[in-house]
Interface confidence: low
Amino acid sequence: IPVIEPSGPELVVKPGETVTLRCVGNGSVEWDGPISPHWTLYSDGPSSVLTTTNATFQNTRTYRCTEPGDPLGGSAAIHLYVKDPARPWNVLAKEVVVFEDQDALLPCLLTDPVLEAGVSLVRLRGRPLMRHTNYSFSPWHGFTIHRAKFIQGQDYQCSALMGGRKVMSISIRLKVQKVIPGPPALTLVPAELVRIRGEAAQIVCSASNIDVDFDVFLQHNTTKLAIPQRSDFHDNRYQKVLTLSLGQVDFQHAGNYSCVASNVQGKHSTSMFFRVVESAYLDLSSEQNLIQEVTVGEGLNLKVMVEAYPGLQGFNWTYLGPFSDHQPEPKLANATTKDTYRHTFTLSLPRLKPSEAGCYSFLARNPGGWRALTFELTLRYPPEVSVIWTSINGSGTLLCAASGYPQPNVTWLQCAGHTDRCDEAQVLQVWVDPHPEVLSQEPFQKVTVQSLLTAETLEHNQTYECRAHNSVGSGSWAFIPISAGARTHPPDEFLFTP
């Protein structure tokens, strides 16, 4: 470790005196940092000598000597005070830059250690420090503002009491930079724009950053636009706003607009699309099938997507029949706006009743005219079945009527014993009717079919069941003959043995 003569650690001299600082080491030694021109530096064997014949207050500072060849990297230091009665401070820097929450060293060095008791830090013009300014003082280094805040970035002066009078240093400007977390925040409004040719339009690109050093520009397709920038500062952030105002838009104004902002942390961009149209438009569509089938008692939401410019002047849901003149309750109609030009309209139909089947139309109007989209709603019903014994053309016949939607299919079963419903074990014969006769098939209503089972003899102690089913459910009716000895006579094409 090198050694400095005089031994120090401090040396106090008067202005004009000669000062010699000698550093001696085992190997070659050198003085750290820039040495001012007022010093003479020469080497004398293993030592390095700094000397000045006319010390001034500006020579006040710490001088450090190192031995480059020392593996331990040792150094020695001496602090020189040149106590000038007119100059209590030697300011090493007029400006100090730190990041927020770092310690800021204001390097005003006291030229006379005796003055340490009367030092203070003030803001420029002798204004007191801001509340909560936590600082400390070292005569060797100056004032340290601990964990500096952005708002503490101001001009400071170091003050020393000399003969009962406060003597100030030149000012030191402290710049406290915010730690930039990332690229500037951006907004581009509107997110989408549609205008009819000849209308006015405005696109606003704004960026905000916690530091003033950032750039922002607006680009149309690949062209950077020259737009005047408005700057502001609020909510502790710098704002830069670019406003593109177009008096009468034309097709060449259409396209992609990008708002781009950058700072030391990088670039951030956001885009929007500007569409210019010849005239007003109104388009209705649905992701749903326009023909809907729902089981009675269940609910359904009918959804219509509307794309329109200019905005809608009116809209409503209408029930077109055929069952009643009721209209959908307004509280069941809901509108949501996906964005400026696209809307979704929903009609909720909970617990559907038979009388609510039919046509539902959504109508909308804007300056482009009227448009309508109509849904056909058919209700699904499980089959209802009834069987009667009748005579047709002199032949005894079982007549099964099944009503439901979708159209039910019909199966006849003959089973042993008297029972309300045939089960698999009891079934003796099964006849499937491939083409039951359709008795009624009106739109939005149940389909009624009938199937005939011609019987020569209905056997006693047996049950004849008509079963109907569709996608919703099934229904059945069991017929038990009263007279014995009868036999059935199904059509040949029906017959199979289970």
């Epitope: 420029l124 013009r125 101001q154 001009d155 000012s171 400007r173 710049k175 003033v212 500062f233």
Partner: antibody, heavy 126, light 107 residues
Amino acid sequence: QVTLKESGPGILQPSQTLSLTCTFSGFSLTTYGMGVGWIRQPSGKGLEWLANIWWDDDKYYNPSLKNRLTISKDTSNNQAFLKLTNVHTSDSATYYCARIGPIKYPTAPYRYFDFWGPGTMVTVSS
Amino acid sequence: DIQMTQSPASLSASLGETVSIECLASEDIYDNLAWYQKKPGKSPHLLIYYASSLQDGVPSRFSGSGSGTQYSLKINSLESEDAATYFCLQDSEYPWTFGGGTKLELK
């Protein structure tokens, strides 16, 4: 752009109170580091600094007039005010208001008047 | 109070000449000095701040220098529009004080 304009009574009598208004635009007295000051210049004489008010409502007065001066501001209307009580004929002068603006906003308060109003002439006469 | 003594009180020079105006402070003002230009019927106009920093938009023929108690304003290559009264302002200590002014006339 930054503009300031002073307004006042023009003429008043000794012992009355002089009330001056500085209406400004292009900046706000809520902005960190900003200030407004008042200066006067009697005809044929030099400039005399009267008072400053800062964004944080810090006020500074010329000690020679301190007991007679009051500076205030109305940030919502972009105005600063100066009251001088018990006026004498020696208070006749052109009164200026000026902005003390930031150098590198808002890290360091500026220390000089960077924009001035055109001035308003005040005559104290019996 | 810090007294600011400005000299000369008046000055006459020709177009293209270089002139200097001095301000002497009664004590060290640590570079806290500004220079202004004032034309008749107009507001004062800031030229130099912090002794030597040129205000935005001010022609580079204006320059400020000095330290401690002595400061000067130099105008190179005088132009006709430079005819005006010039004054200094110290803000090192309250009360802020102005120099008495220098009236520059062009021959």
